[in-house]
């Protein structure tokens, strides 16, 4: 399955939108920094078959979509930007879902992939728990926004590696 070029552009657009969503100066939030333990190894395309990598990407985008679709998220961000951001993520999910169906038919996805998806889910659980502990404060959301920008950048790099493998 070849992800369309529009998928990469969508990922870039999502990153730009997320970058524009900030409402407060991040300089006031330095002491709120937190180690979410991003599962970097899951974004290393070299160790995965293509089907696995696409499944990990799908989970990453799905969890990001879920995080920014909550009521608390709606209260935190400017509505039109949030809607555009969610639309970009939704389009990416559609692209990836088509690929997941196609690729899983070609390759049997081993248990290792379940571990990778679980690692991504646990990562987002840590992010959600942080937001709860910080009572969804503006700084907590600002830290999470920075973290998601970082993880989306990793996703973009994984997609680039996948295209080079084709």
């Amino acid at each position: 399955c070849d992800l369309p070029q529009t998928h990469s552009l969508g990922n870039r657009r999502a990153l730009i939108l997320l970058g524009q969503m900030g409402r407060i100066s991040p300089f006031s939030c330095l002491k709120d920094r937190h180690d979410f333990r991003i599962p970097q190894e899951e974004f290393d395309g070299n160790q995965f078959q293509k089907a696995q990598a696409i499944s990990v990407l799908h989970e990453m985008i799905q969890q990001t979509f879920n995080l920014f679709s909550t009521e608390d998220s709606s209260a935190a961000w400017e509505q039109s930007l949030l809607e555009k951001f969610s639309t970009e993520l939704y389009q990416q999910l559609n692209d990836l879902e088509a690929c997941v169906i196609q690729e899983v038919g070609v390759e049997e996805t081993p248990l290792m992939n379940e571990d990778s998806i679980l690692a991504v889910r646990k990562y987002f659980q840590r992010i959600t728990l942080y937001l709860i502990e910080r009572k969804y404060s503006p700084c907590a959301w600002e830290v999470v926004r920075a973290e998601i920008m970082r993880s989306l950048s990793f996703s973009t790099n994984l997609q680039k590696r996948l295209r080079r493998k084709d």
């Epitope: 900030g22 991040p26 330095l30 002491k31 920094r33 830290v143 920075a146 973290e147």
Partner: antibody, heavy 121, light 107 residues
Framework: EVQLVQSGAEVKKPGESLKISCKGS????????IGWVRQMPGKGLEWMGI????????AYSPSFQGQVTISADKSISTAYLQWSSLKASDTAMYYC??????????????WGQGTLVTVSS | DIQMTQSPSSLSASVGDRVTITCRAS??????LNWYQQKPGKAPKLLIY???SLQSGVPSRFSGSGSGTDFTLTISSLQPEDFATYYC?????????FGQGTKVEIK
């Protein structure tokens, strides 16, 4: 390879203006903040201020607020430090360094080579 | 502002010695402390971040510990290339502040 390359040494007279630069390469320039640090001859390190190149938001140390201006041009991946009226006490080595912002990652992990500014009549 | 106080301001040691430098913050900074090494005429180099994480490429003889207000940089076995000035820096809040430095000289 991540690199921060600073402009060359400057010799200026008191009252003159100056703008020194720091060009980033090998990484996404807008994903990191750029900080500026002063080191006067034979002295320690002093943090001056920082900029987020993605939107040019800045923060300054109270000691340097109003004395210098930090700016950035993300289109050419370059941050700047400028003075409108130099004093002899501005004579120092100035370093730029990248900062991960709100991400949990090493602070000031890459530094420029430094720009020596000499102010003398 | 958060004041950072290093001790000692200088020390003399021999190759192979275990060297300890301390840094105290004027208020709690959790674990938001970095250590840098600077050699004459060179830019500082990050050694340790978030109090105890070893920066990539830094030899394992360097280690950091502490949290709250008291922090330590330890060089387990001093090497000839370790003679330099060491700075701590808090990254807990703005304005960021450095310690005054500790110069490690050859005995």
């Amino acid at each position: 390879e991540v690199q921060l390359v600073q402009s060359g040494a400057e010799v200026k007279k008191p009252g003159e203006s100056l703008k020194i630069s720091c060009k980033g390469s090998g990484y996404s320039f807008t994903s990191y903040w750029i900080g500026w640090v002063r080191q006067m001859p034979g002295k320690g390190l002093e943090w001056m201020g920082i900029i987020d190149p993605s939107d040019s938001d800045t923060a300054y140390s109270p000691s340097f607020q109003g004395q210098v201006t930090i700016s950035a041009d993300k289109s050419i991946s370059t941050a700047y430090l400028q003075w409108s009226s130099l004093k002899a006490s501005d004579t120092a080595m100035y370093y730029c360094a990248r900062h991960p912002g709100l991400n949990w990652a090493p602070d000031f992990d890459y530094w420029g080579q430094g720009t020596l500014v000499t102010v003398s009549s | 502002d958060i004041q950072m106080t290093q001790s000692p301001s200088s020390l003399s040691a021999s190759v192979g010695d275990r060297v300890t430098i301390t840094c105290r913050a004027s208020q709690s900074i959790d674990g938001a402390l970095n250590w840098y090494q600077q050699k004459p005429g060179k830019a500082p180099k990050l050694l340790i971040y978030f109090a105890s994480s070893l920066q990539s490429g830094v030899p394992s003889r360097f280690s950091g510990s502490g949290s709250g207000t008291d922090f330590t940089l330890t060089i387990s076995s001093l090497q000839p290339e370790d003679f330099a000035t060491y700075y701590c820096q808090q990254s807990f809040d703005f304005p960021l502040t450095f310690g005054q430095g500790t110069k490690v000289e050859i005995k």
